[in-house]
């Protein structure tokens, strides 16, 4: 809902509800926090009947499932909102599906957001 | 150490107004969102405004829209809630919480409370 | 607006009990949901956020869970500091919205 800041990271910024919520629709995030928490980006997005929908993209909090992602992958199989994190700066850039299935070898899905 | 101070709450008759503030330390106060969130007496948590660090993106619950104002000063360290056309309602303790990222808002930290009363 | 349910509303417990909380969306809302313990007369604290990640100071017994539309709050074994009342929130999309509670009271 809310918007911060912080010198210490960068991340590609996206709202699909820009217009309600009052937001801008894209831009660079700088990202914020406590100095002992280790800061993030995401996506966020759908896919609808093969067509992707990005609904959100910015800075995450200090969450250990993005530790160490150099990319932004999402490996759940087939949720209905699609998420990944990473680390670095604007490594929210590009995002992909990877999804793990025990007996069927995953496909790659990467997807690259259009400029708005 | 991160403190919210709210003050400004009290009894007010139907229609009347009320202002309400969140003094704020501790922290970088102009790098973080805030929110106001309420709790009427017995009942659970309803979030009501939020504001961005720079005060240009609020946002409201349709409850409250047109009725209330969220606010800041940030060379104040402070976040105001002007409350107008109160109702009944709105009776509830009036909490301040620190926001986190305006797509992720755990918010990490609140102050004590202040209780409105709206009441003939 | 997404709804958020919890279940139960109030459980009874006691010291050293696993406890098991779940929240409901009306709606697939990813890893975007935290928990709040609130004690009666006492602000709400942060406790998980984003489904899974244990807030500042929080012991490690309480763990989250869940992604999309179901989530669960896990208190591995019960301390007396623990009785409160627990809250879920979404912040998928605005306006944020809270389940209704589970009150965890003393057996």
């Known amino acids: 809902a809310i918007l911060g800041r912080s010198e210490t990271q960068e991340c590609l910024f996206f709202n699909a509800n820009w217009e309600r919520d009052r937001t801008n629709q894209t831009g660079v995030e700088p990202c914020y926090g406590d100095k002992d928490k280790r800061r993030h980006c995401f996506a966020t997005w759908k896919n609808i009947s093969g067509s992707i929908e990005i609904v959100k993209q910015g800075c995450w909090l200090d969450d250990i499932n993005c530790y160490d992602r150099t990319d932004c992958i999402e490996k759940k199989d087939s949720p209905e909102v699609y998420f990944c994190c990473c680390e670095g700066n604007m490594c929210n850039e590009k995002f992909s599906y990877f999804p793990e299935m025990e007996v069927t070898q995953p496909t790659s899905n990467p997807v690259t957001p259009k400029p708005p | 150490e991160v403190q919210l101070l709210e003050s400004g709450g009290g009894l007010v008759q139907p229609g009347g107004s009320l202002r309400l503030s969140c003094a704020a330390s501790?922290?970088?106060?102009?790098?973080?969102?805030m929110n106001w969130v309420r709790q009427a007496p017995g009942k659970g948590l309803e979030w009501v405004s939020g504001?961005?660090?720079?005060?240009?993106?609020?946002s409201y619950a349709d409850s409250v829209k047109g009725r209330f104002t969220i606010s800041r000063d940030n060379s104040k360290n402070t976040l105001y809630l002007q409350m107008n056309s109160l109702r009944a309602e709105d009776t509830a303790v009036y909490y301040c919480?620190?926001?986190?990222?305006?797509?992720?808002?755990?918010?990490?930290?609140w102050g004590q409370g202040t209780l409105v009363t709206v009441s003939s | 607006d997404i709804q958020m349910t919890q279940s139960p509303s109030s459980l009874s417990a006691s010291v050293g009990d696993r406890v098991t909380i779940t929240c409901r969306a009306s709606?697939?809302?990813?890893?975007?949901l935290n928990w709040y313990q609130q004690k009666p007369g006492k602000a709400p604290k942060l406790v998980i956020y984003?489904?899974?990640s244990l807030a500042s100071g929080v012991p490690s017994r309480f763990s989250g869970s869940g992604s999309g539309t179901d989530f669960t709050l896990t208190i591995s074994s019960l301390q007396p500091e623990d009785f409160a009342t627990y809250y879920c929130?979404?912040?998928?999309?605005?306006?944020?919205?809270f389940g209704g509670g589970t009150k965890v009271e003393i057996k």
């Open positions: 984003a489904a899974t």
């Open positions: 919480a620190r926001a986190a990222n305006w797509h992720d808002t755990a918010l990490d930290y």
């Open positions: 501790g922290f970088t106060f102009s790098d973080y969102g």
């Open positions: 504001i961005n660090y720079n005060g240009g993106y609020t």
């Open positions: 929130q979404q912040s998928y999309d605005n306006p944020l919205t």
């Open positions: 709606q697939s809302i990813s890893r975007y």
